[in-house]
Every structure is written in structure tokens, then in C-alpha cells.
Interface confidence: low
């Protein structure tokens, strides 16, 4: 039988009446165009909805937008278009919502051709009031908030000027011209690249990387011959052109660009690229594209300095056209990532790592599924997950994989069961243990979302026909109830719930279409009465994460420690609540070879935990570039995995000696870097 339809599924009592009393419809007084929705702050209940409608006239396009505000999680909306003087808002800039709970919002208005500058509307009280401000420039990008101070904004102008505001957009100052890319770093630092000759495109590979730590009073050139730069965790990366040819290499800094080291990564040519797939304060996942238009490359994982890299995964799918990769951080369990590889036969297969890239494996075949036509052996196959690449290829996949940090262990994704990803209509699968085991959750493609930290999962069938039914589960997707939320079906466009998965409200967005008109409509359903009581201690059970063999003493040890979580029992129908905090108990493990990556010049043969010397480097001195000096590495082949907390046990020796020689890096060495003040 289909999941949720067997006898074991107990029904949630009187749920129809409970949900009917908590279903709120709002019909928007708009012609259908586009709609965008933003939450303002966390747990505030404030939602802004911007609807835009373009009327094509013979000579030009006339635009109209409306702004709506809700302060009860979308149950009721108020038209506040008059607060922005009925101005047409440019949707490509979106609604710039301030960090944390600052309550700040910036909307960028459309202005007529001859105007001196753009116009913004600013609010610092969760969109209760807006102030109109005319800009001394035309913005090219959305306003960017400093992560440390929401009063500090930066923007690029259409003339490549870098503009900064210190008073939340009230007053603006151009701090530099000829800027290609600008990003906030930590401590209100701004990093940006500049061109000297013609343009950003013409000077690619000859750009300079600059830094200002005082919002434009003074500057420091921290790099030359720059192709691009990026920030990830505590690392600053720059791809730098080589002196002699058209190749470029990654350089990395952990001190805001004062000193640089050459990353031990392959150099790339003109047609190739580097991409930071994921980064935290411990390490980086870096994709290095293969030469030629292969559509794949190699994932490398860094050491704690971002300098020495280990090969993590070969043939990693990352298309150059459109730049699609399936790389997904499973946020519901530490150390877990999912991605796709392109096989020799050009089929696409899903791989998963549970130890932050140390080892990759196929996903275990779900118990309740059979292998499809892609499988050579009908009894042996794996689950393959549809993510960004499948969506870009217009497969019948409405959503990417979903996981939430506070819904521990839960991963929901579309997939197929076989030897590779199938182009057939996918089903929805769920894992409750962070990707170790999977179960078919729903037949066919669905939209899905997690509410109340995993206490409720909501799904809507992906259909070209109008819909009026929502499905929900209170036991992590084992059993499903269906609720008809309206008599009149709507053309469904999206599910919206507050980011963070703590809410118990879900908004179903869509439009109604009659003979003459078409209108936006939303239905907000509050599940609070389904989960009638607050969860108590008895509703939770102890769960050991990463447990694969309970009889093994190192069971659950990942990156040097194991974690026990308190998790809601599947049978408990109760509210985790908005203030729910994940309860976990870590314990340190003894070190094994698994807690070490292979050092520079070493690799791990398949199915072995020992690191052996790379044949091509045997007998050579291991030398690499660190802070612009050449270093000699004495190693027995191991280095601790970044973030690994193990103690005791195996302790391989590792020593680095300064060779007192300059590296052959064309990058600016610290003593050559120049500073200047405005």
C-alpha cells in the first residue's frame, strides 16, 4: 500500500474541524502578475508581500505594484501601498530585509529615465512606516547590509561606483570608482575589486583587490592580477592570474588579506572555474572544474588554514552552462553533505558523505522501494536525489532537498531508486537519521515544508490542475492526513512558512482564474490546534546520531565526537513550540586514523584508512607555499580533520619547517602592499 494508507496509521482526532477554524483566506485586490514575499524579523509574524503587474503599452511598459503587510503570520493582510506613495517597486532588487531582528526594510523604486538618481523607501520599524530617500546614484545591485551593523549599507551604481551609507540609507557617499564586485567582510570591513583600464570584463585577471576597514576613509590594496574573490567562513579567497600564462590559482588569507598563501589546488585555465561549495570557520569545500566542457570537476576539502587540500570526490557534477550543482549541506545532521557525480557513461548518481567529505558513498536503497529500469540488478541499487540540476533540466521536480537544523535528522527530497537518476516522475523520500536510511514518503512529486521543528510535515501535490487539498503528517512522514482547505481549487504557486521551521503556520499561495479576471489568493493554516498540548519530557527519546553499529564502541563517532539528541517520538502529537531548542549531549571519542586527512603529498587508497605517499612525489621534498614563504613539510602523511575534536588514541607526527625562501607566487607579498587614505 502507499505510504500512510496502511492500517497502522491512526488518524489525528477531529482535525478537519480544528483546521477549518484555523484556515484564513486572503484574496488580493490585484491582477495577477508576480508576487514576492518576505519575512521581516524572526518570530515577529510580520510578512511583506509585493505584487507587481506589467501592462505592455505600444511604446513602453507600464508597471504597477502593491505592498501588503501582515503581522499575524499571513492570516490577514493590509494594503500599505500608500506608505510608499503608490510607487512602482523594482522586483529585481527584491525587498532588502535587515539582518537579525533589526526590523529594517529597503525597497528600491522604479524612477523615470531622466532622473539624477534612484529612489528607495526605508523602514526601521518592521514596515509600519517608510521614509522616501532620493539617491545620488542609480543602483546596480540591491542594498547590502553590514552583518555587524544594520545601519551600514553598501551598493554599486550603474556607473561602477561603490557607495556607502552609515545612517541606514539616509545619506550616501561614493568611496571608490571603477568597482566590479564588493562584499562585506567581518568587523564592517569591505572588500572590493577595481579595474584600471577599460571595464570589469576587459580587466578580468588584472583587477586589484582592495580593502577598507573604516567605511572608505582609508584603503589598502591587498592583491593584484585578480580574476575574482570570495569569502567563506573565516577565509578570504582570490583567484590570481599566473605570471607566464593564462592560468590562475587560488590564494587564501585568514587575516583579512594582510598575508596570503597559495592554496595547494590545481591551477585552472580560461574556460575553467573554482567554486566555494561550502565553508565554515573550520574548513572549505572547493570545487575545481576539469579542463574542457566536461560538466564535472573535483571536490577538495581544506585543512584548517584553507591551504592544504585533500581530494574528496572525483567527477563532481557542476555544469558550466548555467552553473548547476547538486551540492547540498544537510543542515539537520553535522557532517552530512549530498551531491551528484557524473559517471563514465554520463549517467548521474547521488553520493553522500557523513564525515564532512572524508568518504562518499551511495545512498542506501529505501526498504519500501524497488529498483527502477536504470538498475542492472533488480535487487541492488541506490536512491538518487533530484536537486538543482534536475530542476534546471525541467524534470518534474518542484523542490530541492529540504533539511532544517532544528528538525534533527530529517531530510526530505525527490528521488528515484536505481543505478542513476531517472528522468521518470520522481517520488518523495524521507530520512529520519540524516541520510543513512530512507523511506518513500509520498508517491509522485510534491511541495513540502517542515513546521514546528519537525513536529509537522506539510505537503501539496505538484499538479498542473488547480488544487484544494493539503497533506500533513505528525509522525515524520509515516502517516498522512488530507485536508480540503477550500471548496474552490486554486492554481497553486507556492508554499510559504517562516524560515527556521519553528512556525505552525503554513501559507498556500496561488491564483484563481475566472472568465475575466485572475487574482492572487493565499490560505494560511495554523496547525496549533492539531498539536493541542506542549511536548513534555516523556514525548522525547534519546537518539545517537551517526549510529550505524550499536555494538561498536566508536559507534556515532564523527569528527572526533558523538552526539546524543533528545528527539520527539514519532507517536507523540504535541507542540515543540517556538522556543524549542535542540538538546544534545556531546562526548569526545579517542582518535583513530579516521580523524585524520591525508597530508599534502599523500592519499588514501580506496577502502583503506592508511595514507600512502603519492607515487609522483615519492622521494621528493614536500614543499609548499605559506604566507609567501616556502615551507618544508615533515609528515607521516596525516593531519587532523578541521573541526575534529577527538583526543588520545592515534597521534601521527607532523612538523612544518620554514625554508626561508620566497614562493614563486606572483601575488603581492605583504611588504609590497600599499595603503592610502581618502
Amino acid at each position: 500500500s502507499a505510504p500512510g494508507e496502511d492500517e497502522e496509521c491512526g488518524r489525528v482526532r477531529d482535525f478537519v474541524a480544528k483546521l477549518a477554524n484555523n484556515t484564513h483566506q486572503h484574496v488580493f485586490d490585484d491582477l495577477r502578475g508576480s508576487v514576492s514575499l518576505s519575512w521581516v524579523g524572526d518570530s515577529t509574524g510580520v510578512i511583506l508581500v509585493l505584487t507587481t503587474f506589467h501592462v505592455p503599452l505600444v511604446i513602453m511598459t507600464f508597471g504597477q505594484s502593491k505592498l501588503y503587510r501582515s503581522e499575524d503570520y499571513g492570516k490577514n493582510f493590509k494594503d500599505i501601498t500608500d506608505l510608499i506613495n503608490n510607487t512602482f517597486i523594482r522586483t529585481e532588487f527584491g525587498m532588502a530585509i535587515g539582518p537579525e531582528n533589526s526590523g529594517k526594510v529597503v525597497l528600491t523604486a522604479e524612477v523615470s529615465g531622466g532622473s539624477r538618481g534612484g529612489r528607495i523607501f526605508r523602514s526601521s520599524d518592521f514596515a509600519k512606516n517608510f521614509v522616501q530617500t532620493d539617491l545620488p546614484f542609480h543602483p546596480l545591485t540591491q542594498m547590502m547590509y553590514s552583518p555587524q551593523n544594520s545601519d551600514y549599507l553598501l551598493a554599486l551604481s550603474t556607473e561602477n561606483g561603490l557607495w556607502v551609507s552609515k545612517n541606514f540609507g539616509g545619506k550616501w557617499e561614493e568611496i571608490h570608482k571603477a568597482v566590479c564586485l564588493a562584499k562585506w567582510g567581518s568587523d564592517n570591513t569591505i572588500f572590493f575589486t577595481t579595474y584600471a583600464n577599460g571595464s570589469c570584463k576587459a580587466d578580468l585577471g588584472a583587477l586589484e583587490l582592495w580593502r577598507t576597514s573604516d567605511l572608505g576613509k582609508s584603503f589598502k590594496t591587498i592583491g593584484v592580477k585578480i580574476y575574482s574573490f570570495g569569502l567563506g567562513g573565516r577565509f578570504l579567497f582570490a583567484s590570481v592570474m599566473a605570471d607566464k600564462d593564462t592560468t590562475r590559482r587560488i590564494h587564501v588569507s585568514t587575516d583579512q588579506g594582510d598575508t596570503w598563501s597559495m592554496a595547494q589546488l590545481p591551477s585552472v585555465g580560461q574556460e575553467q572555474f573554482y567554486s566555494i561549495l561550502a565553508a565554515n570557520d573550520d574548513m572549505v569545500f572547493m570545487h575545481v572544474d576539469e579542463p574542457g566542457d566536461t560538466g564535472f570537476g573535483t571536490i577538495f576539502t581544506s585543512d584548517d588554514r584553507g591551504i592544504v587540500y585533500s581530494k574528496s570526490l572525483d567527477r563532481h557534477l557542476y555544469t558550466t552552462t548555467g552553473g548547476e550543482t547538486d551540492f547540498t549541506n544537510v543542515t539537520s545532521l553535522r557532517g552530512v553533505y549530498i551531491t551528484s557525480v557524473l559517471s563514465e557513461d554520463n549517467s548521474i548518481q547521488t553520493m553522500i558523505t557523513f564525515d564532512q567529505g572524508g568518504r562518499w558513498t551511495h545512498l542506501r536503497k529505501p526498504e519500501n522501494s524497488e529498483c527502477d529500469a536504470t538498475a542492472k540488478n533488480k535487487n541492488e541499487c541506490s536512491l538518487h536525489i533530484h536537486a538543482s540540476y534536475s530542476i534546471s533540466q525541467k524534470l518534474n521536480v518542484p523542490m530541492a532537498p529540504l533539511s532544517e537544523p532544528n528538525a534533527v535528522g530529517i531530510v526530505i527530497a525527490h528521488g528515484s531508486v536505481g543505478d542513476a537518476i531517472s528522468v521518470m516522475v520522481p517520488d518523495v523520500y524521507i530520512s529520519d537519521d540524516g541520510g543513512y536510511s530512507w523511506t518513500k514518503m509520498l508517491e509522485g512529486p510534491h511541495y513540502y515544508t517542515i513546521l514546528d521543528s519537525g513536529g509537522i510535515i506539510v505537503a501539496i501535490e505538484h499538479s498542473s490542475r488547480p488544487i484544494n487539498v493539503i497533506k500533513f503528517s505528525t509522525d515524520e512522514g509515516q502517516c498522512w492526513q488530507t485536508y480540503t482547505f477550500t471548496r474552490d481549487p486554486i492554481y497553486f504557486t507556492g508554499l510559504a512558512s517562516e524560515p527556521g521551521a519553528r512556525s505552525m503556520n503554513i501559507s498556500i499561495w496561488g491564483f484563481t482564474e475566472s472568465f475575466l479576471t485572475s487574482q492572487w489568493v493565499s490560505y494560511t493554516i495554523d496547525f496549533k490546534d492539531i498539536l493541542e498540548r506542549n511536548c513534555e519530557e516523556k514525548d522525547y527519546t534519546i537518539w545517537l546520531a551517526h549510529s550505524t553499529d550499536p555494538e561498536d564502541y566508536e559507534d556515532g563517532c564523527i569528527l572526533g565526537y558523538k552526539e546524543q539528541f533528545l528527539r520527539l517520538r514519532k507517536s507523540s502529537v504535541c507542540q515543540n513550540g517556538r522556543d524549542y531548542v535542540v538538546t544534545k549531549q556531546p562526548s569526545i571519542c579517542l582518535c583513530s586514523l579516521e580523524d585524520f586527512l591525508c597530508d599534502f603529498g599523500y592519499y588514501r587508497p580506496e577502502n583503506d584508512s592508511k595514507c600512502v605517499e603519492q607515487p609522483e612525489l615519492k622521494g621528493h621534498d614536500l614543499e609548499f607555499c605559506l604566507y609567501g614563504r616556502e615551507e618544508h613539510l615533515t609528515t607521516n602523511g596525516y593531519r587532523k580533520i578541521p573541526g575534529d575534536k577527538c583526543q588520545g588514541g592515534v597521534n601521527p607526527v607532523r612538523e612544518v619547517k620554514d625554508l626561508k625562501k620566497k614562493c614563486t607566487s606572483n601575488f603581492l607579498s605583504p611588504e609590497k602592499q600599499n595603503s592610502k587614505s581618502n
Partner: antibody, heavy 129, light 107 residues
Framework: QVQLVQSGAEVRKPGASVKVSCKAS????????MSWVRQAPGQGLEWMGI????????SYAQKFQGRVTMTRDTSTSTVYMELSSLRSEDTAVYYC??????????????????????WGQGTTVTVSS | EIVMTQSPATLSVSPGERATLSCRAS??????LAWYQQKPGQAPRLLIY???TRATGIPARFSGSGSGTEFTLTISSLQSEDFAVYYC?????????FGGGTKVEIK
Amino acid sequence: QVQLVQSGAEVRKPGASVKVSCKASGYTFTKYYMSWVRQAPGQGLEWMGIINPIGGSTSYAQKFQGRVTMTRDTSTSTVYMELSSLRSEDTAVYYCARDPSGIAAAFPAGRYYYGMDVWGQGTTVTVSS
Amino acid sequence: EIVMTQSPATLSVSPGERATLSCRASQSVSSNLAWYQQKPGQAPRLLIYGASTRATGIPARFSGSGSGTEFTLTISSLQSEDFAVYYCQQARLGPWTFGGGTKVEIK
């Protein structure tokens, strides 16, 4: 040198409890697990359980579950094994043994086991009414 | 749990002769196996770990072989101090389990 010194012989009545200590010296205490093994008179060796000295986490053989408690005191580098609800068949010599299984590398082909390389001298526990 | 079976229970060998002791596991333990020697009134002593590696200070006449479920301890030329009880022990899956022991006695 590396050694494990156990507490002296004990005599207990049925239903009572006994707590045996094992003091480690000559190596870093937190670097190795500690197993407890017992041997009834004229019988073979029987493994009771293991303790990780870093976090104090334990794993016990099913047979002793609920009756055995293993603890450690890192300040004195001592491991303790307490056995409750004693019966006459618990009469045996109890050994602590350093068990470097914690430094094993758990990879798909299986872990590499180093064996219990250092043993205590044994503590005789006699259960008699 | 994994059951370890040793054979024979008793082995009578003359000094200077070769002794071959067997140990069988009820399921694969890979190479996670150790051999111990125990003399009367003494604690066991580790001889072999990882199925085939001699522990520190163990004479070369002791050797271990095997993998999976079948293991062998060989004493190439028995010395008088080698007459004792020998135990095998697996550490693939908890609980660790010992074989019943093989007593090597003087013929």
C-alpha cells in the same frame, strides 16, 4: 613502566555489591579504553564491558547489563568496576585490561584491533553465604 | 553475539615440536582477533593482535594467521615455558568474546 594495579581480594555475601579498582600508571590514562574480564575457577575468560576514560561512556555485555557499573576518575587515573546483586556464580578473578581498541581506525574493511596489551594482576572476589 | 570456538580443547605436544591451534568465529571478524597466553595463577598475556601481528616482546616462534572466520596460532618449536592455556578473542562487534581456550600440555 606501564602497569595496572588492582585492589585486594574481597569476600561478599549473596545479594551484596563489590567495587574493584584498577589504577593505571606509566602511560596517558585517557589514551586507552579499559576492559574488564573475569575468570571463574577452572573456567575460561569472560568479557564484561569497556569504558572510554575520556567521556566515561561505557558498553556492557548483555549478561551483566543492569548489574555492572564502570566508572573512572581521571584525576587519579583509576577505573572502577562495581557488580551488584552478587550470586555464588560471580565468584571469580576479575581483571582490568588496557584495551587500545579506541585507537582503531573504523573503515569499511573493519577496524584494526590491537588486543588487550596490559593486564592487572587480578582481584579475587568470593561470594559465599 | 559472535561465538568463538577453539579446537582442540587440549593439545599434547613434545618440546621442540610444532603446535597448531585453531579458532573459528561464528561470523566474520575480519582481522580483529587477538591471541592470549595464560599460565596458572597469572593474568593473560597478549601474544598476537590484528590476527597476525606479534605483540611487543613476543618471540618469533609465535605466529598468527587467518582472516574472516578461520584463524590459526602456530608455535613453531615449543619451549618449556610455552605450556599454558591459549585463548583467542574477537573485537569486531561488541560484546568482545573469547574462545573456550586450548590447553597445550607436555606429551
